[in-house]
Interface confidence: low
């Protein structure tokens, strides 16, 4: 009744949309909670973060395991008081993801 | 004093983080603003959406051109009154992106 090829295409797409670590652009300063007079160049780095869809609305795509990877960035103070310095910055990298229940909105319900 | 190879790696990563169309998982029902008694299987599809970083905080990564691509999905009505039907669903696909100024917070400033 349904064309097998079409179903295969749909299924492949569904697999690709599912909750998994996916390469994401992350803003370093927000990530590290740095003071406003310090910024980084480049301001963003690529890391893997959990994303994608879960089968049910009550589930959310969450990280189950994390590693920290080091990125070399220029740390710059404003006003520019010294030459930008290359510093290693550790950023969270999600290595495992799972569809987990969201925390209940009302803790006593 | 800065290792040229390190700089090359940093620059390549920066290029990859910049504002561009990137494959994203989109929830179809939210996208189409469908009523709660209709849902789709799979619930999500992959399309390209603008994402990534801009050089300045005052700029935001926005789409400058869009195409609409057709995805074959099962549309299901609740309560289930008929066999789930394969329907073509048109979803926005960003084909061009640019770092554009965010709308001013105070329209009269």
């Amino acid at each position: 009744f349904y064309d097998i090829e079409t179903l295969k295409v749909i299924d492949e797409e569904w697999q690709r949309t599912q909750c998994s670590p996916r390469e994401t652009c992350v803003e370093v300063a927000s990530e590290l909670g740095k003071s406003t007079n310090t910024f980084f160049k480049p301001p963003c780095v690529n890391v893997f973060r959990c994303g994608g869809c879960c089968n049910e609305e009550s589930l959310i795509c969450m990280n189950t395991s994390t590693s920290y990877i080091s990125k070399q960035l220029f740390e710059i103070s404003v006003p520019l008081t010294s030459v930008p310095e290359l510093v290693p910055v550790k950023v969270a990298n999600h290595t495992g993801c799972k569809c987990l229940p969201t925390a209940p909105r009302h803790p006593y319900s | 004093f800065y290792d040229i190879e390190t700089l090359k790696v940093i620059d390549e990563e920066w290029q990859r983080t910049q504002c561009s169309p990137r494959e994203t998982c989109v929830e179809v029902a939210s996208e189409l603003g469908k009523s709660t008694n209709t849902f789709f299987k799979p619930p999500c599809v992959n399309v390209f959406r603008c994402g990534g970083c801009c050089n300045e905080e005052s700029l935001i990564c926005m789409n400058t051109s869009t195409s609409y691509i057709s995805k074959q999905l099962f549309e299901i009505s609740v309560p289930l009154t008929s066999v789930p039907e394969l329907v073509p669903v048109k979803v926005a696909n960003h084909t061009g992106c640019k770092c554009l100024p965010t709308a001013p917070r105070h329209p009269y400033s």
Epitope: K41, L80, T81, P84 | -
Partner: antibody, heavy 117, light 112 residues
């Protein structure tokens, strides 16, 4: 191998504008973190930092001389140009071009500029 | 501006003997990021300055181990354990913690 070379007039008259060019190789001013700057040294005196320009075209000047200085870059030619207006005999110095890292590692050989009528 | 004061102005030395140069800054050179950007350069006659020591005590590559740097805050010292004839020239301290970056007046090291 990083090299920098300064070029410009050896003699300028008081009130004239000095234009110096730094031509460099071994790096690019489009590379992240790169900067080129100028430092001068009057005969037998201390070094004085003048200005520098960064890969993103940010410019920084010594506040004492800011009103007289302009620094610019031509990334495709690997050149940085410094102009200094209203020259005076006290501006007689050897002018050095440097690759701006922390600290300064690579310096040009310097060019002596004499201000005299 | 940060004033960098070097002493002595001139230092006559005997080859094989130690030598010491002092550099004092008008403000602390500890940067907001914790680093101290105090560097030492040697300018040999007719040449451009060359880096010897960076960030107080780190010898730049190729610099002989007879050169050492120390100090903190506002007081810094460059020591040569055994002076050699090739060490003659003018030694400058420099700070790049605060803008404008500034240099000391120089210490001329010459053989007695």
């Amino acid at each position: 191998q990083v090299t920098l070379k300064e070029s410009g007039p050896a003699l300028v008259k008081p009130t004239q504008t000095l234009t110096l060019t730094c031509t460099f190789s071994g790096f690019s001013l489009s590379d992240y973190g790169m900067g080129v700057g100028w430092i001068r040294q009057p005969p037998g005196k201390a070094l004085e930092w003048l200005a520098n320009i960064w890969w993103e075209d940010d410019k920084y000047y010594n506040p004492v001389l800011r009103s007289r200085l302009t620094i610019s870059k031509d990334t495709s030619k690997n050149q940085v140009v410094l102009t200094m207006t209203n020259m005076d005999p006290v501006d007689t110095a050897t002018y050095y071009c440097v690759q701006v890292t922390n600290p300064f590692v690579f310096w040009g050989e310097g060019t002596l500029v004499t201000v005299s009528s | 501006d940060i004033v960098m004061t070097q002493t002595p102005l001139s230092l006559p030395v005997t080859p094989g003997e130690p030598a010491s140069i002092s550099c004092r800054s008008s403000q602390s050179l500890v940067h907001i990021n914790g680093n101290t950007y105090l560097h030492w350069y040697l300018q040999k006659p007719g040449q451009s300055p060359q880096l010897l020591i960076y960030k107080v005590s780190n010898r730049f590559s190729g610099v002989p181990d007879r050169f050492s740097g120390s100090g903190s805050g506002t007081d810094f010292t460059l020591k040569i354990s055994r002076v050699e004839a090739e060490d003659v020239g003018v030694y400058f301290c420099s700070q790049s913690t605060h803008v404008p970056w500034t240099f000391g007046g120089g210490t001329k090291v010459e053989i007695k």
